[in-house]
Amino acid sequence: TPLGPKWPEPVFGRLASPGFPGEYANDQERRWTLTAPPGYRLRLYFTHFDLELSHLCEYDFVKLSSGAKVLATLCGQESTDTERAPGKDTFYSLGSSLDITFRSDYSNEKPFTGFEAFYAAEDIDECQVAPGEAPTCDHHCHNHLGGFYCSCRAGYVLHRNKRTCSALCSGQVFTQRSGELSSPEYPRPYPKLSSCTYSISLEEGFSVILDFVESFDVETHPETLCPYDFLKIQTDREEHGPFCGKTLPHRIETKSNTVTITFVTDESGDHTGWKIHYTSTAQPCPYPMAPPNGHVSPVQAKYILKDSFSIFCETGYELLQGHLPLKSFTAVCQKDGSWDRPMPACSIVDCGPPDDLPSGRVEYITGPGVTTYKAVIQYSCEETFYTMKVNDGKYVCEADGFWTSSKGEKSLPVCEPVCGLSARTTGGRIYGGQKAKPGDFPWQVLILGGTTAAGALLYDNWVLTAAHAVYEQKHDASALDIRMGTLKRLSPHYTQAWSEAVFIHEGYTHDAGFDNDIALIKLNNKVVINSNITPICLPRKEAESFMRTDDIGTASGWGLTQRGFLARNLMYVDIPIVDHQKCTAAYEKPPYPRGSVTANMLCAGLESGGKDSCRGDSGGALVFLDSETERWFVGGIVSWGSMNCGEAGQYGVYTKVINYIPWIENIISDF
């Protein structure tokens, strides 16, 4: 029997009946075996076919076989009901080999010319399957020349049979208190040749409950218990299953906090699998009863292990555990059925005793010592000497535990010293002056620091003075010894103040005239205001109306008196304001340089002399009574004058304070 070409030779060629294209002889038998490479098949078609027609092709025929299977037995020229001629058909081997057998019997009624056929090897597309046939691959089939391979969707792995996709369904751990798990692809058929392991692992104290839901369909057998596919449930106490078939298994109360579910499938079958809804239970904790003025959240029918609740207090109440305030409270149910924390109390917010108000006092309005939520207190300043700054002094204990003003401020009100109070209400009759009485000049400050000078108290922690009086101490403020609250220069019964900083006007030039002869001293502590220590007022915008020519101002100090010594007792003098041009002219004669008197100065004194401020009075205030407010204000600062105090035709020269209000306000607000 002639053999066709063998792989790896090129697999294509021509076959023909003996003697073709002439007629074939009787009693011929010819066999060709064609072999293609693995993964290939053979394609065959006829270009000529002319054989004797006989019933079921019993006489002459061409038979095509592939392995044990006969593909076709051909005869005649055209197909009939019982016989087949190839016509234009193409024939394919089932595998990689094709057998062709030609036979003629002992006679022919007429001559027949036989056949001519062509063949070639071609790739088999293994991925193409006939309808109703099992697919080549479980998931994805990939054809290639000479073969194919299978691959799997994510979550699956190719079985060692290279066709089946086994599910990657092990190692899943469920830790939530409830959940759902199901066979892979549920409710579609589960994969073959898979072994799935699921773990439910809850905290100790929980007990897992398994409920099979919706449908259950696992391949079974009528006689043997789950021999093919099965589901098993294992706890540390016992094993449940195996389960298979179509009946939903009953609820399983595992009494265990850990459960392992195993699902094993074989290579066959088409079943939808199973779905489990699991829950858990634990020993319940006592039902939490909210404390008075509080509520529990969330509200549940029961609370078991790991359940928690929080307590929220009503507005104006705060959480207290014993005596300790809590920002929040959450209790957690433990495995033994007890709460991990005792119930707190909702105690009314207590703002506590209100802070003392410097230079003021506080009064309980709601009731003596009542400091709880919505309680009201009233701050007030010490009468006469202090007044409350932009605040009505009424504070309420709010829910946040802070005393809060009607404007929502949590800071204390401020008691500002009342300025310009004096025991002296009218001008009386220093050089040519008279002794001050207690309370006459409570703003008077004695400044010692190399020389004796004076100043005037502003607010409760600033002193206004002359730049020339403190110039030497501008870099050593602490060297200034500041005394107030006494009339006697040599009395130990003074209130001591100390300088924190000295601010000299930037326009002042030492030893080059007295323009801008003004300075501020910041005290390192506030002084207590009383009848002997009271600040002077700064001039209002309207103050110039009380400082016109011939208006009376009062200067005070411990400076030189007519006897030529510093005064032991505070002295004062009432002096009229002098016309500015007149004063300028008085100081244009030698030895005074031109322009000695500037617009930043004012002059006061008598043309006849005898009343003046003098050395040692420098920096002190020349004060005026504001008849509208009935308060004294500083109009001038003792600055300079003639060498001989109280000289006729010469006047005391004072720094004009009203020109410096912005400078004073800026310094005080900045520092």
Partner: antibody
């Protein structure tokens, strides 16, 4: 030289009064304050009060406000301290001391020799 | 009232020793004054305004400090220095004294 000479020791019964004198010399009496202090046996120093010798203005600490009286006699440059309603705890050495007038005015640069006042029934 | 606490309350030292006495105030004081008192005698001013030596006082005595802590130092103790030492303040009314420090011969 500057000195303060105090009167001699006194023994008084409870409820009585005592008046201790302090004569100043060697300085201008009216330029200074005169302070009075006391020292109980084995104890520290306690301030009573002071008097301005120029105008007799007095200051007492709260404890002695009602029982102590400070006076001066400018003509003899003498200061006096009278303590009334004596009790046994008033037994002490009483000192007069001159107040400084050079710096803070708040310390004592010259002291009397002290007067022992014993209160005993 | 401002309380002044002296330490130590007493000390034993030898001639030539350096001795330091501290005076702690319950609140800040600007100036401290120191006095020496011998048995049966009136106190004598040693230091005024914290660090200034009073007239006639030997230079072995010195004062220092600020705020609440002040110190009296005797650089080389002499036989005549065995006495009780007091600090005094009047930054705040009323003036007060420390309880005293007794310096004895070792």
């Amino acid at each position: 030289q500057v000195q303060l000479v105090q009167s001699g020791a006194e023994v008084k019964k409870p409820g009585a009064s005592v008046k201790v004198s302090c004569k100043a010399s060697g300085y201008t009496f009216t330029n200074h304050h005169m302070h009075w202090l006391r020292q109980a046996p084995g104890q520290g120093l306690e301030w009573i009060g002071d008097i301005d010798a120029s105008d007799s203005e007095t200051h007492y600490i709260e404890k002695f406000k009602d029982r102590a009286t400070l006076t001066i006699d400018k003509s003899s440059s003498t200061a006096y301290m009278e303590l009334s309603s004596l009790r046994s705890e008033d037994t002490a050495v009483y000192y007069c001391a001159r107040g400084d007038i050079t710096t803070t005015l708040r310390y004592f640069d010259v002291w009397g020799q002290g007067t022992l006042v014993t209160v005993s029934s | 009232d401002i309380q002044l606490t002296q330490s130590p309350s007493s000390l034993s030292a030898s001639v030539g020793d350096r001795v330091t006495i501290t005076c702690s105030a319950s609140s800040s004081v600007r100036y401290m004054y120191w006095y020496q008192q011998k048995p049966g005698k009136a106190p004598k001013l040693l230091i005024y305004d914290t660090s200034n030596l009073a007239s006639g006082v030997p230079s072995r005595f010195s004062g220092s400090g600020s705020g609440t802590d002040n110190t009296l130092t005797i650089s080389s103790l002499q036989p005549e220095d065995f006495a009780t030492y007091y600090c005094q303040q009047w930054s705040s009314y009323p003036l007060t004294f420390g309880q005293g420090t007794k310096v004895e011969i070792k």
